[in-house]
């Protein structure tokens, strides 16, 4: 039975041209994290494999940086970066946990972080 929960940074906003950290945290389980995938809609941004380390998609190397931790940093944000982001935790023996973050990239300087929320 999957007992864990994913805590994410929830709905967040950031300024165009700026940077943002996408963070997820898996809790309430003793399962071993073997890999974390970061996706934007259906596009792969990065993989952090427990044995092999980080793989940053060649399509995003200019604007994506690994970390901190299992998180992901998006740089040089554009309005086209607005949308859903997913952290997909592959664990043993539980299986897969998915967290969702919605990022809104704003033209103005009115960019405030939203509250955290959990996805079981």
């Amino acid at each position: 039975m999957m007992t864990g929960t994913i805590e994410t940074t929830g709905n967040i906003s950031a300024e165009k041209g700026g940077s943002i950290i996408l963070q997820c945290h898996l809790s309430s389980t003793t399962a071993q994290v073997t890999q974390v995938n970061w996706e934007q809609q259906d596009q792969l941004l990065a993989i952090c494999n427990a044995d092999l380390g980080w793989h940053i998609s060649p399509s995003f190397k200019d604007r994506v940086a690994p970390g901190p931790g299992l998180g992901l940093t998006l740089q040089s944000l554009t309005v086209n970066d607005t949308g859903e982001y997913f952290c997909i935790y592959h664990t043993y023996p539980d299986g897969t946990y998915t967290g969702r973050i919605f990022l809104e990239v704003l033209e103005s300087s009115v960019a405030e972080h939203g509250a955290r929320f959990q996805i079981p």
Epitope: Q35, N37, L44, I47, N49, D51, L52, G53, W54, H55, I56, P58, S59, K61, D62, A65, P66, H90
Partner: antibody, heavy 118, light 113 residues
Framework: QVQLVQSGAEVKKPGASVKVSCKAS????????ILWIRQAPGQGLEWMGD????????NYNEKFQGRVTLTADTSSSTAYMELSRLRSDDTAVYYC???????????WGQGTLVTVSS | DIVMTQSPLSLPVTPGEPASISCRSS????????????LAWYLQKPGQSPQLLIY???TGESGVPDRFSGSGSGTDFTLKISRVEAEDVGVYYC?????????FGQGTKLEIK
């Protein structure tokens, strides 16, 4: 030890399709990308595309977009490259190779010669 | 697309002598986040599949003789063979794996004088 074993040589007519297989062993198949590289006779190396069996993510060289399809069967640790609407200039040796992020293409298959001739 | 340009295209070398191959990319291959260059060198011996010699521009692949070394950063890279041996003949390729589509140099054919 790590091995990538490809299917045998093929002879095809123009307009036909070919499907080349690449069976992986000696490592966790779902951890590494499988890239497909081709080499025309006496020519250099050309990247066609790649697939990540751990998530079925794919990327294609625009030159081949619409003609090449990459798939992977995790149950048999086998990757496939299908090239359709073959032309004579598709005559080449096709290689599969594994890759992960920083480490480049560290193991290669033996290559599969595909000859397109009427 | 990133264009990879190698020189020379042909390299006759006397056994025991050093050899050097240059590779230039049309864009920087340095990833700022880890300060690594996504540049690899391969050797394709006659009738064989290519084999990886160097990744990250300067890190030798396991099992590759230490007479092979890579250097450079950004857009200019070099593969050096300290003392060429007969078994080193073949075509040497540089390749960028920084961004799609991955691209290769034209190849440098090393032959024994």
């Amino acid at each position: 030890q790590v091995q990538l074993v490809q299917s045998g040589a093929e002879v095809k007519k123009p307009g036909a399709s070919v499907k080349v297989s690449c069976k992986a062993s000696g490592y966790t198949f779902t951890n590494y990308w499988i890239l497909w590289i081709r080499q025309a006779p006496g020519q250099g190396l050309e990247w066609m595309g790649d697939i990540y069996p751990g998530g079925h993510y794919t990327n294609y060289n625009e030159k081949f977009q619409g003609r090449v399809t990459l798939t992977a069967d995790t149950s048999s640790s086998t990757a496939y490259m299908e090239l359709s609407r073959l032309r004579s200039d598709d005559t080449a040796v096709y290689y599969c190779t594994r890759y992960y992020g920083p480490y480049a293409m560290d193991y290669w298959g033996q290559g599969t010669l595909v000859t397109v001739s009427s | 697309d990133i264009v990879m340009t190698q020189s020379p295209l042909s390299l006759p070398v006397t056994p025991g002598e050093p050899a050097s191959i240059s590779c230039r990319s049309s864009q920087s291959l340095l990833y700022n986040s880890n300060q690594k260059n996504y540049l690899a060198w391969y050797l394709q011996k006659p009738g064989q599949s290519p084999q990886l010699l160097i990744y990250w521009a300067s890190t030798g692949e396991s099992g590759v003789p230490d007479r092979f070394s890579g250097s450079g950063s950004g857009t200019d890279f070099t593969l050096k063979i300290s003392r060429v041996e007969a078994e080193d003949v073949g075509v040497y390729y540089c390749q960028q794996y920084y961004s799609y589509p991955f691209t290769f140099g034209q190849g440098t054919k090393l032959e024994i004088k």
